[in-house]
């Protein structure tokens, strides 16, 4: 029973349980393909426990292997719309520091209006994740249609 | 070595490792869009460790942040079928208690026959998750095509 | 503080944090629908911590419930290509030992060029996971478009 007590007394952060789930705040200006995210209990069911937001982009605070997941739904979209505006592509990557810049996850919409995926990837303290949506369609801001999150899995 | 021993001696439930993976049992009667789930080793590779089923719906037993995931494939489906019967939509949400009712995850099939997604969300003991499939197509009952699960991630 | 120290002193393997993320190496010869995977820091962001590769297939080293996830993108693909070459199907399953052979996860591409999904499933030490891609289209080898991984979740 001592372990359970000790576990409860330790701050969760020391267990490495960094986790975040974000909702879409807004898209960038015309030449900026990035999606800008927001999170926090006041906004609904989004949250940040460990990672932080830096101008709408997610910054990692703890080294480790993370499960990164995302779903993006296009607004006012049908399969006809999606195919007409192809290619619409979503990419998740490390955008800073520049020395670690890399695309982690990439999907095209083709004739669909939603993409959803997830992957495991090593991330380091200070890595900032950017989500780039290229194309001429807007992402839905509905919190059950568009979201982005990370979960620390192991060192 | 003492920690490893202590960890083994503690029931897993005290570590908060609640997890469930369910397979489709049946659809509801005509006016009920809910999918009804089942789980347990006798049924194959589905299981419930912590959460419970209440009339085919998943009830949470431990507060925390959960990874919720789902895949639903439509039966005898082609891209023509899927587009013809649009909108066919799947929504996962908290359906009880009514005070906490909210849609957590929503996807449309458009010209595809399978949707799959996942998200992190806070859930509380007593929350019941419902999966609503609206449209005129049947979900596949094959266990490798349609499944629904949750995994406790952190308090 | 003693718990945190003890946790750090224990090898991670004893905590059961087996995890792997793989990138596509190559496809099989004509009659072999399996995808052959590779992983390791020298290759980029793929890794194996616990599980091993056996002739390009993933072998599990620890009993437990795992989150299995995959994304496969077809090379030089458009919705027209995908629908023309239908059915193109991806299946993830236990392929050995033969006594435990079963399909865990199955998706068709229909009019899309990417599939992505995830599920929780019990796996046992010695289980080898195979990913079968049937059809006449090649999978992309880009590491942000095609990947396959597992994460140990609980005993």
């Amino acid at each position: 029973q001592r372990f359970a007590q000790a576990q409860q007394q330790l701050p969760l952060e020391s267990l490495g349980w960094d986790v975040a789930e974000l909702q879409l705040n807004h898209t960038g200006p015309q030449q900026d393909p990035r999606l800008y995210w927001q999170g926090g209990p006041a906004l609904g069911r989004s949250f940040l426990h460990g990672p932080e937001l830096d101008k709408g982009q997610l910054r990692i605070h703890r080294d480790g292997i993370y499960m990164v997941h995302i779903q993006v739904t296009l607004a006012i979209c049908s399969s006809t719309t999606a195919s007409r505006h192809h290619p619409t592509t979503l990419a998740v990557g490390i955008c800073s520091p520049a020395s670690r810049s890399i695309s982690l996850l990439r999907l095209s919409f083709h004739q669909g209006c939603t993409i959803a995926s997830q992957r495991l990837t090593p991330l380091a303290r200070g890595d900032t994740l950017c989500t780039n949506l290229t194309g001429t369609l807007l992402p839905s801001r509905n919190t059950d249609e568009t979201f982005f999150g990370v979960q620390w899995v192991r060192p | 070595q003492r920690f490893a021993q202590a960890q083994q001696q503690l029931p897993l439930e005290s570590l908060g490792w609640d997890v469930a993976e369910l397979q489709l049992n049946h659809t509801g009667p005509q006016q009920d869009p809910r999918l009804y789930w089942q789980g347990g080793p006798a049924l194959g590779r589905s299981f419930l460790h912590g959460p419970e089923l209440d009339k085919g719906q998943l009830r949470i037993h431990r507060d925390g942040i959960y990874m919720v995931h789902i895949q639903v494939t439509l039966a005898i489906c082609s891209s023509t079928t899927a587009s013809r019967h649009h909108p066919t939509t799947l929504a996962v949400g908290i359906c009880s208690p009514a005070s906490r009712s909210i849609s957590l995850l929503r996807l449309s099939f458009h010209q595809g026959c399978t949707i799959a997604s996942q998200r992190l969300t806070p859930l509380a003991r007593g929350d019941t998750l419902c999966t609503n499939l609206t449209g005129t197509l049947l979900p596949s009952r094959n266990t490798d095509e349609t499944f629904f699960g949750v995994q406790w991630v952190r308090p | 503080q003693r718990f945190a120290q003890a946790q750090q002193q224990l090898p991670l393997e004893s905590l059961g944090w087996d995890v792997a993320e793989l990138q596509l190496n190559h496809t099989g010869p004509q009659q072999d629908p399996r995808l052959y995977w590779q992983g390791g820091p020298a290759l980029g962001r793929s890794f194996l911590h616990g599980p091993e590769l056996d002739k390009g297939q993933l072998r599990i080293h620890r009993d437990g419930i795992y989150m299995v996830h995959i994304q496969v993108t077809l090379a030089i693909c458009s919705s027209t290509t995908a629908s023309r070459h239908h059915p193109t199907t991806l299946a993830v399953g236990i392929c050995s030992p033969a006594s435990r052979s079963i399909s865990l996860l199955r998706l068709s591409f229909h009019q899309g060029c990417t599939i992505a999904s995830q599920r929780l499933t019990p796996l046992a030490r010695g289980d080898t996971l195979c990913t079968n891609l049937t059809g006449t289209l090649l999978p992309s080898r880009n590491t942000d478009e095609t990947f396959f991984g597992v994460q140990w979740v609980r005993p």
Partner: antibody, heavy 120, light 111 residues
Framework: EVQLVQSGAEVKKPGSSVKVSCKAS????????MHWVRQAPGQGLEWMGA????????SYNQNFKGRVTITADKSTSTAYMELSSLRSEDTAVYYC?????????????WGQGTLVTVSS | DIVMTQSPDSLAVSLGERATINCRAS??????????MHWYQQKPGQPPKLLIY???NLESGVPDRFSGSGSGTDFTLTISSLQAEDVAVYYC?????????FGQGTKLEIK
């Protein structure tokens, strides 16, 4: 409750065409395939084809070798089945039918049937 | 096309007794965890009436003395206790693929 009401009996000459109508009420016409099934006197049931009124897509039984044409008018919730190059063996009761909830080809609702007699 | 073969062609059963009609498909009509097999009852001068869908599901309003079973290629319609109003022709039908096809029918009479 869905109701399917068909047009009245017809007597036709061999080589001519017949067009049977089926008016739907009480349901969402455009969301479900409307099927046509025929039954020759004292014989079994034979599926002829179907239309999805939402977009006009059709499926036909190849046994009719292009002689059958199914159309739909969403504005009046009416489906039509036209059979050309009639011969005596086309004498049958023609039914329209559809599912109640799931849009697969089993048939909860049926029209009352239209007897088409082909005789010289 | 999938060929549906019913047996017997005709059947005479005493009131209150069990009636069993079989239907065999020339290939499996099961897919996605369902059996796409359905049963109808047709009385003279009336359109067919759906009794059972997806092999074993009782259509709303149909008496529970009717039941269906089977999977793959072999299916059975059972009337547990025959009533006078059950005299009719019974058809099986698949909807696994296009075209859907019907069995030739089984005529059920009272012995």
């Amino acid at each position: 409750e869905v109701q399917l009401v068909q047009s009245g009996a017809e007597v036709k000459k061999p080589g001519s065409s017949v067009k049977v109508s089926c008016k739907a009420s009480g349901g969402t016409f455009s969301r479900y395939n409307m099927h046509w099934v025929r039954q020759a006197p004292g014989q079994g049931l034979e599926w002829m084809g179907a239309i999805f009124p939402g977009n006009g897509e059709t499926s036909y039984n190849q046994n009719f070798k292009g002689r059958v044409t199914i159309t739909a008018d969403k504005s009046t919730s009416t489906a039509y089945m036209e059979l050309s190059s009639l011969r005596s063996e086309d004498t049958a009761v023609y039914y329209c039918a559809r599912n109640s909830y799931y849009d697969y080809a089993w048939f909860t609702y049926w029209g009352q049937g239209t007897l088409v007699t082909v005789s010289s | 096309d999938i060929v549906m073969t019913q047996s017997p062609d005709s059947l005479a059963v005493s009131l209150g007794e069990r009636a069993t009609i079989n239907c065999r498909a020339s290939k499996s009509v099961s897919s996605s965890g369902y059996s796409f097999m359905h049963w109808y009852q047709q009385k003279p001068g009336q359109p067919p009436k759906l009794l059972i869908y997806l092999a074993s599901n009782l259509e709303s309003g149909v008496p529970d003395r009717f039941s269906g079973s089977g999977s793959g290629t072999d299916f059975t319609l059972t009337i547990s206790s025959l009533q006078a109003e059950d005299v009719a022709v019974y058809y099986c039908q698949h909807s696994r693929e296009f075209p859907p096809t019907f069995g030739q029918g089984t005529k059920l009479e009272i012995k």
